[in-house]
């Protein structure tokens, strides 16, 4: 059977400062069971951008409604983009673990570049 794939269709996205950036991500399956999180950067120093379960992410909204059944769309939108937001964003599927979830598969990443705000 086909294993879950994490699809980030855009390799890069360019957004003007002050605008919102939409970072797209889709899963091909509902299983294995476990959460999806967004990070900027890779490796040990990566920054958590969005985790629905815990944390406060006031600039991040999910593209699909949080109450949508059997959702496979895990795209997010980040508002009020600044140059400091530039970087590569990864959509990551975790496999449910006890007590800790285990990283299962990552998308290829989407590089966000920030253009100067039009004068």
């Amino acid at each position: 059977e086909d294993e879950l794939q994490v699809i980030q269709p855009e390799k890069s996205v360019s957004v003007a400062a002050g605008e919102s950036a939409t970072l797209r991500c889709a899963m091909t399956s509902l299983i294995p069971v476990g959460p999806i999180m967004w990070f900027r950067g890779a490796g040990a120093g990566r920054e958590l951008i969005y985790n629905q379960k815990e944390g406060h992410f006031p600039r991040v909204t999910t593209v699909s409604e949080l109450t949508k059944r059997n959702n496979l769309d895990f795209s997010i939108s980040i508002s009020n983009i600044t140059p400091a937001d530039a970087g590569t964003y990864y959509c990551v599927k975790f496999r449910k673990g006890s007590p800790d979830d285990v990283e299962f598969k990552s998308g290829a990443g989407t590089e966000l570049s920030v253009r100067a705000k039009p004068s």
């Epitope: 059977e1 294993e3 879950l4 399956s29 509902l30 299983i31 294995p32 069971v33 476990g34 959460p35 999806i36 629905q52 379960k53 999910t62 699909s64 409604e65 949080l66 109450t67 949508k68 059944r69 059997n70 959702n71 895990f74 496999r95 449910k96 006890s98």
Partner: antibody, heavy 119, light 108 residues
């Protein structure tokens, strides 16, 4: 959606049983599946859940019960070993459903199969 | 493990009346809570998920509310088929998935 459990019966303490759940009416391989049990006159108790290769168990059955699935047969199984009197219950098979970024609840249930552990 | 406490254990209501009962979680489960109905001799049936969303086909007289640790299921104008046991279930933090002990709604 239809879920039909079978394999229940009367077994002596220390014995084994294998429960089956035949699923139809949905794309079985795309969903996690769960066993929930109900002791006589008692409430509902989660037993085990399976995603793709990922399996999860209640502490009360860990090491004794094994959940598995055969996607080619649209069938869920629960192998129950070292059975105890406290395992006596109606065992329900349930289809998992998710809400967007959250965990699982159970949107379809079978009618259950009764397991009695008694000498 | 998150413990769900349902109250009251038994609720006696006359047909046509309103029934309200609660489910309290031992810790915050956000909106990750479902409600099930179980009629005598039958399997449980999903009524509500995400604390407040009615499952397809569930009558409008059933409504869920609350978030965090306090949740309520309300049945307006009880019908004869509504006399059953009602369970809440959290899916915020698992394993294990946990259920409340149930509220039995009986005819007054």
């Amino acid at each position: 959606v239809q879920l039909v459990e079978s394999g229940g019966g009367v077994v002596q303490p220390g014995g084994s049983l294998r429960l089956s759940c035949a699923a139809s009416g949905f794309s079985f391989s795309n969903f996690a599946m769960t066993w929930v049990r109900q002791a006589p006159g008692e409430g509902l108790e989660w037993v085990s859940t399976i995603g793709s290769g990922d399996t999860y168990y209640a502490d009360s059955v860990k090491g004794r019960f094994t959940i598995s699935r055969d996607n080619s047969k649209n069938t869920l199984y629960l192998q129950m070993n070292s059975l105890r009197a406290e395992d006596t219950a109606v065992y329900y098979c349930a289809k998992d459903s998710t809400v967007s970024w959250s965990g699982d609840f159970f949107d379809y249930w079978g009618l259950g199969t009764r397991v009695t552990v008694s000498s | 493990e998150i413990v769900l406490t349902q109250s009251p254990a038994t609720l006696s209501v006359s047909p046509g009346e309103r029934a309200t009962f609660s489910c309290r979680a031992s810790q915050n489960v956000k909106n990750d809570l479902a409600w099930y109905q179980q009629r005598p001799g039958q399997a449980p049936r999903l009524l509500i998920y995400a604390a407040r969303i009615r499952e397809t086909g569930i009558p409008e007289r059933f409504s869920g509310s609350g978030s965090g640790t306090e949740f309520t299921l309300t049945i307006t104008s009880l019908q004869s088929e509504d006399f059953a046991v009602y369970y809440c279930q959290q899916y915020y933090d698992w394993p294990p998935f946990t259920f409340g002990g149930g509220t039995k709604v009986e005819i007054k």
